[in-house]
Interface confidence: low
């Protein structure tokens, strides 16, 4: 017995939709059936229908077919929403292009190539002919529409209304000419429904002849409509399963759009200096991962073999060895040139702020009167008059209300780091605005510093090398874990807050991180009784350029014999030169059989000017940096201790005076380390602790 072909692939489905006829003269036919496939077969063959079937509705609740001689484009008809209905329209009647010779074309073009109006098929004026609708049943010789009932070369044609021109072909394009895609067609949502060899595509919502997992309801964003070619899985171009039982799938012949433009919805905003969203549009030239390891070229297979080549990922700008996000990862990344580290994120690229033209402030911006009203993370500022109670809570004088108009960025509390505003977002009560200090403005924001000159040096990841194992009074030391591995140090400065470095967060997903407290061994061995493991609930990034992060814990740490907080210095304080200090960390220690124990290295404070000299004058320190040199040659911070503290004692009080960030080399003799100067940011830290809500224990 010959297997009857399944014709539902010839229909365009509109879920939860039905057609209502406004014109009562329009006919309709109904019948109880089990499946939409049965409706389709009958519609295609016009079996037992008193009209040419152009569409049908399947009523899922009543298991009923409603066949129509019209479709949604016909006059006297309107579309209506209905949960139980699915509308199927024969693609031949709504397609405005032809496949092959256009034998199946049933569209409504009725003008010839040279612009002459077509003669109706049922008329013999001005040209007599034998192409009567009754003689060519199923060929839809309706009205005066262009048709190709015999499948002749040249495509659809018609007799013309011009007595001088008997017939002429119509200018209906090939579907393969109309359809075009950008890049590899991942965003293609066109109507191509056959493969490059001409095979008809299988519907995505069908499992015959080929079973597959690309179910429309499982992938609602992949555009699995009807049986159109799609690229859901990052292939070189769109493809589909075919109706040929012997050919599971095949690519479709869809040309690349001439100007290669994408819809606005598909194009990630291109940036070169910063990351917007997940950085899929980042087109800058950063070419190292977060810890300074250089990237491998995208067109190279050494040291890592991969498929992320410029040929496979067109439009993703996989040039040179620049950080990119071709695959929808959480941020730009690259393969690295280190054979032991396959990939890394380039999380040192800053998030785009909302920089607004030439707006700038002088000093600390307390006199700034511009009208920017957006934070650096893009949040809209809330009105000052709604936040006065909060403002009074952390300043001890009456703010100048005349300056606090509308929701403009201002600096009513003399913040050292520039204008800010309240946001109305309970998670981020306030934040700084993306305004820079005016060029050439050298007003120091705090006094008693050598030279407030910005430094630009940066180097590799840091670890404590050749330190002495330590156990006493280090309860404030935090091991920040990234995907269960130690990545950075940190200091517990309050039960719910850890001070650490911005470079410690390669991923934006907070679920990737946890804080281990009360440990001495980096793996927690032997620390089970004293260890506290806490999730991270928020990251508060420090003022622009600070490299600091305040990490909020999901619940407060319990202070005990093993876990304690460390004090912060007073804002703007200076500590005498030669003061003895220490850095702490679990990073690689220079020993072959590294035991994983927390190390300490002893350093002494050095003035910024002297420090600059030790760096052969190549480094000029600014007011936000502090310098400390090793007492022991080759001892100091090195790779892996970012975020950890520089701890100093003054008047019998131990404080965190510096934070280790990617700095100026690793334990090099006569090269002191440069740290973020916590005293410069102390007011910011206090302000965050005071204004950000934390969970109660």
């Amino acid at each position: 017995q010959r297997k009857r072909r399944n014709t539902i692939h010839e229909f365009k489905k509109s879920a939860k939709t039905t057609l209502i006829k406004i014109d009562p003269a329009l006919k309709i036919k109904t019948k109880k059936v089990n499946t939409a496939d049965q409706c389709a077969n009958r519609c295609t063959r016009n079996k037992g229908l008193p009209f040419t079937c152009k569409a049908f509705v399947f009523d899922k609740a009543r298991k009923q077919c409603l066949w129509f001689p019209f479709n949604s484009m016909s006059s006297g008809v309107k579309k209506e929403f209905g949960h139980e209905f699915d509308l199927y329209e024969n693609k031949d009647y709504i397609r405005n292009c032809i496949i092959g010779k256009g034998r199946s074309y049933k569209g409504t073009v009725s003008i010839t190539k040279s612009g002459i109006k077509c003669q109706p098929w049922s008329s013999m004026i001005p040209h007599e002919h034998s192409f009567l609708p009754s003689s060519y049943r199923g060929k839809d010789l309706q009205e005066n529409y262009c048709r190709n009932p015999r499948g002749e070369e040249g495509g659809p044609w018609c007799f013309t209304s011009n007595p001088e021109v008997r017939y002429e072909v119509c200018d209906i394009p090939q579907c393969s000419e109309v359809e075009c895609m950008t890049c590899n067609g991942e965003s293609y949502r066109g109507l191509m429904d056959h493969t490059e060899s001409g095979k008809i595509c299988q519907r995505w919502d069908h499992q015959t002849p080929h079973r597959h997992k690309f179910l429309p309801e499982r992938y609602p964003d992949k555009g699995f409509d009807d049986n159109y070619c799609r690229n859901p899985d990052g292939q070189p171009r769109p493809w589909c399963y075919t109706l040929d039982p012997h050919t599971r799938w095949e690519y479709c012949a869809i040309k690349t759009c001439a100007d290669n433009t994408m819809n606005d919805t598909d194009v990630p905003l291109e940036t070169t200096e910063c990351i917007q969203g997940q950085g899929e549009g980042y087109r800058g030239t950063v070419n190292t991962i977060w810890n300074g390891i250089p990237c491998q070229r995208w067109d190279s297979q050494y040291p890592h073999e991969h498929d992320m080549t410029p040929e496979n990922f067109k439009c993703k700008d996989l040039r040179e060895n620049y950080c990119r996000n071709p695959d929808g990862s959480e941020s730009p990344w690259c393969f690295t040139t280190d054979p032991n580290i396959r990939v890394g994120y380039c999380s040192q690229i800053p998030n785009c702020d909302m920089s607004h033209g030439q707006d700038c402030y002088r000093g600390n911006g307390k006199n700034y009167m511009g009208n920017l009203s957006q934070t650096r993370s893009g949040l809209t500022c809330s009105m000052w008059d709604k936040n006065m109670e909060d403002l009074h809570r952390h300043i001890f004088w009456e703010p100048d209300a005349s300056k606090l108009n509308e929701n403009y960025c201002r600096n009513p509390d003399d913040d050292a780091h520039g204008p800010w505003c309240y946001t109305g977002n309970p998670l981020i009560p306030w934040d700084y605005c993306p305004i820079s200090r005016c060029e050439g403005d050298t007003t120091p924001t705090i006094v008693n510093l050598d030279h407030p000159v910005i430094s630009c040096a940066k180097t590799k990841q840091l670890r404590v090398v050749n330190g002495i194992p330590t156990r006493t009074n280090i309860g404030w030391m935090v091991s920040l874990r990234y995907r269960n591995k130690h990545i950075c140090g940190g200091s517990l400065i309050k039960e719910s807050w850890v001070l650490t470095a911005r470079q410690c967060f390669p991923s934006r997903d907070l679920k990737d991180y946890e804080a281990w407290l009360g440990i001495h061994d980096v793996h927690g061995r032997g620390d089970e009784k004293c260890k506290q493991v806490l999730n991270v609930s928020q990251l508060v990034y420090g003022p622009e350029g600070s490299d600091l992060v305040l990490m909020k814990l999901a619940r407060p740490a319990v202070l005990d014999d093993f876990v304690s907080t460390i004090d912060l210095p007073n804002y703007g304080c200076t500590i005498p030169e030669k003061t003895s200090c220490s850095v702490y960390g679990w990073g690689y220690t220079g020993l072959i059989n590294y035991d994983g124990l927390l190390r300490v290295a002893h350093l002494y404070i050095m003035g910024n000017e002297k420090c600059s000299q030790h760096h052969r004058g190549k480094v000029t320190l600014n007011e936000s940096e502090i310098c400390a040199g090793a007492e022991k040659i080759g001892s100091g911070p090195c790779e892996g201790d970012y975020g950890g503290p520089l701890v100093c004692e003054q008047h019998k009080m131990r404080m965190v005076l510096g934070v280790i960030v990617p700095g100026r080399g690793c334990a090099i003799p006569n090269r002191p380390g440069i740290f973020v100067r916590v005293a410069y940011y102390a007011k910011w830290i206090h302000k965050i602790i005071l204004t950000y809500k934390v969970p109660q224990s």
Epitope: Q207, H210, R211, H212, K213, F214, L215, E217, R218, Y219, K222, P232, D233, G234, Y241, R248, W249, E305, H306, D307, D327, G328
Partner: antibody, heavy 118, light 112 residues
């Protein structure tokens, strides 16, 4: 190849992340799954992450375990382990989506043992 | 969805035939999204059969999968010593908008 790591002894309630490192497998072309096996017991499906990064979990695993991925690793986070979570955890590749309908796991790692005990 | 494997354990002589059944508590949608695995002690499972009857790459033709609906069968003919292992069936079923996967409890095959 597929290799799991991160298994160790943890006290109950201590979050744990297992990492599955793949080589020679393009995670933008293959879905990956996690399956576990308690000592002396049978296989238990945990969940999968598909090529687009969407995750699917067994009913019992929803909210208890989280699967995520980077370009070369697939992670399984056990948010609050209990003693019932003691098992060998296998990471496995799902057979090419376009060559079969089945969720067949055609390439497995050796597994990593997680012991949850106080 | 529960997959019940019978019998367990099952013993066979070298050269003999072993049949393992797997009964599903509900029919698998798309009837045949079904796999069989072999696992030896201390090793990960190895895929033998997928799509109910398709032999995985490198698996000898002595292994044969069959069945549909709720009843599936793995037949090992010409049993060899190396076939001693635990065999698991695996199927998937619809749950919400996703697919869920279930394994059978395993059948131990002892070769005499």
């Amino acid at each position: 190849s597929v290799e799991e790591s991160g298994g160790r002894l943890v006290p109950p309630g201590t979050p744990l992340t297992l990492t599955c490192t793949v080589s020679g497998i393009d995670l933008s072309s293959y879905a990956m799954g996690w399956v576990r096996q308690a000592p002396g017991k049978g296989l238990e499906y945990i969940g999968m992450i598909d090529v687009s990064g969407s995750t699917y979990y067994a009913d019992w695993a929803k909210g208890r375990l989280t699967i995520s991925k980077t370009p070369t690793t697939v992670d399984l986070e056990i948010t609050s382990p209990t003693t019932e979570d003691t098992a060998t955890y296998f990471c496995a590749r799902l057979i090419d989506e376009r060559s079969t309908y089945s969720y067949a796991f055609d390439l497995w790692g050796q597994g990593t043992l997680v012991t949850v005990s106080s | 969805q529960v997959l019940t494997q019978t019998p367990s354990p099952v013993s066979a002589a070298v050269g003999g035939t072993v049949t393992i059944n797997c009964q599903a508590s509900q029919s698998f949608y798309n009837n045949g999204a079904f796999s069989w695995y072999q696992q030896k002690p201390g090793q990960p499972p190895k895929l033998l059969i997928y799509d109910a009857s398709t032999l995985a790459s490198g698996v000898p033709s002595r292994f044969k999968g069959s069945g549909s609906g709720t009843q599936f069968t793995l037949t090992i003919s010409g049993v060899q010593c190396g076939d001693a292992a635990t065999y698991y069936c695996q199927g998937e079923f619809s749950c919400g908008s996703a697919d869920c996967v279930a394994f059978g409890g395993g059948t131990e095959v002892v070769v005499k």
